[in-house]
Interface confidence: medium
C-alpha cells in the first residue's frame, strides 16, 4: 500500500515552537513491538496456485539489513492437476515500507527513512477482459 | 518478513566514538525514494481467486498516518463459477513493516521507530495433507 | 536427510566462555532461521536465541542477553552459540533447531541430539 | 513475554485411552502455536504445527484444535509408544516459548 509523502507537518515542530536545527530530527533508541513476528502458513510461497520464490537482499548500512523480496513463478496459475493454467494470471502484491539508512562519516552518525517497495507474494487472479465497443 | 531486534550494533556508534546521549539517535528530515509507488494490477483484491477487503487505521501521531490492512473474505477459494471451493484455503500474506510514532510534550518533540504486521493481501494454497508413514 | 549436529559442550567454571556449534546437512542451511534450545536434565524446555537466514537477524532470551551470542557461517553450514560469563544456571543439554519455513515464524521441524554444557567449580 | 501454561503436568493413561492435554496462552498467539512429543534422552519431535496441521509421518490418531488462547492436544487412541512428555510452544512473538510439559505415562 501507499506511504503519503512526507512534506508535511508529521516530522516538524508546532508553530509556535523554534524550529529543528540543522534539519533532523531526535530518534529515540529502541523499537516499539519489536518482538512481533509474522506468522504465515509454512510453505505458503510453493503450496499457492501462484507460486513465488524469495530472494534475500543484504545491506548492513540498512535496517532491516536482510529485505525479501518474492517473484512470481508462473505468468499463469497451478491448477488442480498442478499443471499452469494461463488462463489465469499470477500477479505480485506489493507493499510500501520503511528502512532506516545509516550514514557515517567518522563518528557523526545519521540516520535517514527510505521508502522501500517490496514483493510480499503472489495471488491468483481473472485477467482483465476488455470488451471493445 | 522478520524485522530484527534492535539490541544490537546498526544505531550504536563505533566504539571508539563517545557513546550517543541521552539515548537518542539523529534522524535527518526528508525521505529517500518518497516518491517510488506501488505498481500492482487494478482491482486485485477482488480479482484474485482468494479475494479480500481492505481496513485503512489511522493515526495522526504515527506515519504513515493511514496503515491499510487486508482480510481474506473466504476461508475457501473463488473457483472459474465464481462458487467458493473449500478443498483449497484463502490464506493471509503478511508483511513487518516500520512506522515512526510521534511523541510530543509542548515542544519536545521525539520520534521512535515501531514495528506493525500487516497483512498486504491473500493467496489460495492447496491444504496441507499428510500421508502417514 | 537433514541432520543436525552438536557439538562444543563440556564442563566449565562459571565465569567462563563456551563456543558450541552445530554442523548442518541436507538442506539449504541459509534460507532458513536457526535457534538454539536449551533444557535442563529433567525439566522443560527454553528457548535461548534465533539468528535469521543471512545473519543479520539475531534474537535473544531475556536469560542470555548480553552473555551468548548467536552466529552462523553460511559457507559452512555451522551455526554458532558463543556463551560468556557463564552461571551455574546455564547447565543444561543445548539444542540446535531448525525453522521450518523460510519466511516468518515457525516451529522446529528438524532437531539435533544435543550437546551437554555443564557450569560448575 | 508470553507464558503458556499446560495441563495437566502429568496424566495416567491405558493403552486405547483418548487423551487430551491443554495448553493456555497468556494473550492471543493467532494460529502460531505447536506441539512437540519428547522421549527420555532424546530430542523433541514435532508432532502438530499451525494448532492443527499435522507434521508429515506423525499418526493421525494426534490432532490439535483451538484458537487465541486455548489450545488442545489430543491422541485418539493411545498407543504403547506414545508415552512421553508433550510440550506446546508459540511462535507469535519473541521470546519464543514453551509449556511447562505433560507427562504422559502408564496406568
Known amino acids: 500500500r501507499k506511504i503519503p509523502k512526507v512534506g508535511h507537518t508529521f516530522f516538524q515542530k508546532p508553530e509556535s515552537c523554534p524550529p529543528v536545527p540543522g534539519g533532523s530530527m531526535k530518534l529515540d533508541i529502541g523499537i516499539i513491538n519489536e518482538n512481533q513476528r509474522v506468522s504465515m502458513s509454512r510453505n505458503i510461497e510453493s503450496r499457492s496456485t501462484s507460486p513465488w520464490n524469495y530472494t534475500v537482499t543484504w545491506d548492513p548500512n540498512r535496517y532491516p539489513s536482510e529485505v525479501v523480496q518474492a517473484q512470481c513463478r508462473n505468468l499463469g496459475c497451478i491448477n488442480a492437476q498442478g499443471k499452469e493454467d494461463i488462463s489465469m494470471n499470477s500477479v505480485p502484491i506489493q507493499q510500501e515500507t520503511l528502512v532506516v539508512r545509516r550514514k557515517h562519516q567518522g563518528c557523526s552518525v545519521s540516520f535517514q527513512l527510505e521508502k522501500v517497495l517490496v514483493t510480499v507474494g503472489c495471488t491468483c487472479v481473472t485477467p482483465v477482459i476488455h470488451h471493445v465497443q | 518478513r522478520k524485522i530484527p531486534k534492535v539490541g544490537h550494533t546498526f544505531f550504536q556508534k563505533p566504539e571508539s566514538c563517545p557513546p550517543v546521549p541521552g539515548g537518542s539517535m539523529k534522524l535527518d528530515i526528508g525521505i529517500i525514494n518518497e516518491n517510488q509507488r506501488v505498481s500492482m494490477s487494478r482491482n486485485i483484491e477482488s480479482r484474485s481467486t482468494s479475494p479480500w477487503n481492505y481496513t485503512v487505521t489511522w493515526d495522526p501521531n504515527r506515519y504513515p498516518s493511514e496503515v491499510v490492512q487486508a482480510q481474506c473474505r473466504n476461508l475457501g477459494c473463488i473457483n472459474a463459477q465464481g462458487k467458493e471451493d473449500i478443498s483449497m484455503n484463502s490464506v493471509p500474506i503478511q508483511q513487518e513493516t516500520l512506522v515512526v510514532r510521534r511523541k510530543h510534550q509542548g515542544c519536545s518533540v521525539s520520534f521512535q521507530l515501531e514495528k506493525v504486521l500487516v497483512t498486504v493481501g491473500c493467496t489460495c494454497v492447496t491444504p496441507v495433507i499428510h500421508h502417514v508413514q | 536427510e537433514v541432520q543436525l549436529l552438536e557439538s562444543g559442550g563440556g564442563l566449565v567454571q562459571p565465569g567462563g566462555s563456551l563456543r558450541l556449534s552445530c554442523a548442518a546437512s541436507?538442506?539449504?542451511?541459509?534460507?532458513?532461521?536457526m535457534s538454539w534450545v536449551r533444557q535442563v536434565p529433567g525439566k522443560g524446555l527454553e528457548w535461548v536465541s534465533a539468528i535469521s537466514g543471512r545473519g543479520g537477524n539475531t534474537f535473544y532470551a531475556d536469560s542470555v542477553k548480553g552473555r551468548f551470542t548467536i552466529s552462523r557461517d553460511n559457507s559452512k553450514n555451522t551455526l554458532y552459540l558463543q556463551m560468556d560469563s557463564l552461571r551455574a544456571e546455564d547447565t543444561a543439554v543445548y539444542y540446535c533447531a531448525k525453522d521450518d519455513r523460510r519466511i516468518a515464524a515457525g516451529s522446529f521441524d528438524y532437531w539435533g541430539q544435543g550437546t551437554t554444557v555443564t557450569v560448575s567449580s | 513475554d508470553i507464558q503458556m501454561t499446560q495441563s495437566p503436568s502429568s496424566l495416567s493413561a491405558s493403552v486405547g485411552d483418548r487423551v487430551t492435554i491443554t495448553c493456555r496462552a497468556s494473550q492471543g498467539i493467532s494460529s502460531a502455536l505447536a506441539w512437540y512429543q519428547q522421549k527420555p534422552g532424546k530430542a523433541p519431535k514435532l508432532l502438530i504445527y499451525?494448532?492443527?496441521s499435522l507434521e508429515s509421518g506423525v499418526p493421525s490418531r494426534f490432532s490439535g484444535s483451538g484458537s487465541g488462547t486455548d489450545f488442545t492436544l489430543t491422541i485418539s487412541s493411545l498407543q504403547p509408544e506414545d508415552f512421553a512428555t508433550y510440550y506446546c510452544?508459540?511462535?507469535?512473538?519473541?521470546?519464543?516459548?514453551f509449556g511447562g510439559g505433560t507427562k504422559v505415562e502408564i496406568k
Open positions: 510452544q508459540q511462535f507469535n512473538s519473541y521470546p519464543l516459548t
Open positions: 541436507g538442506f539449504t542451511f541459509s534460507s532458513y532461521v
Open positions: 499451525d494448532v492443527s
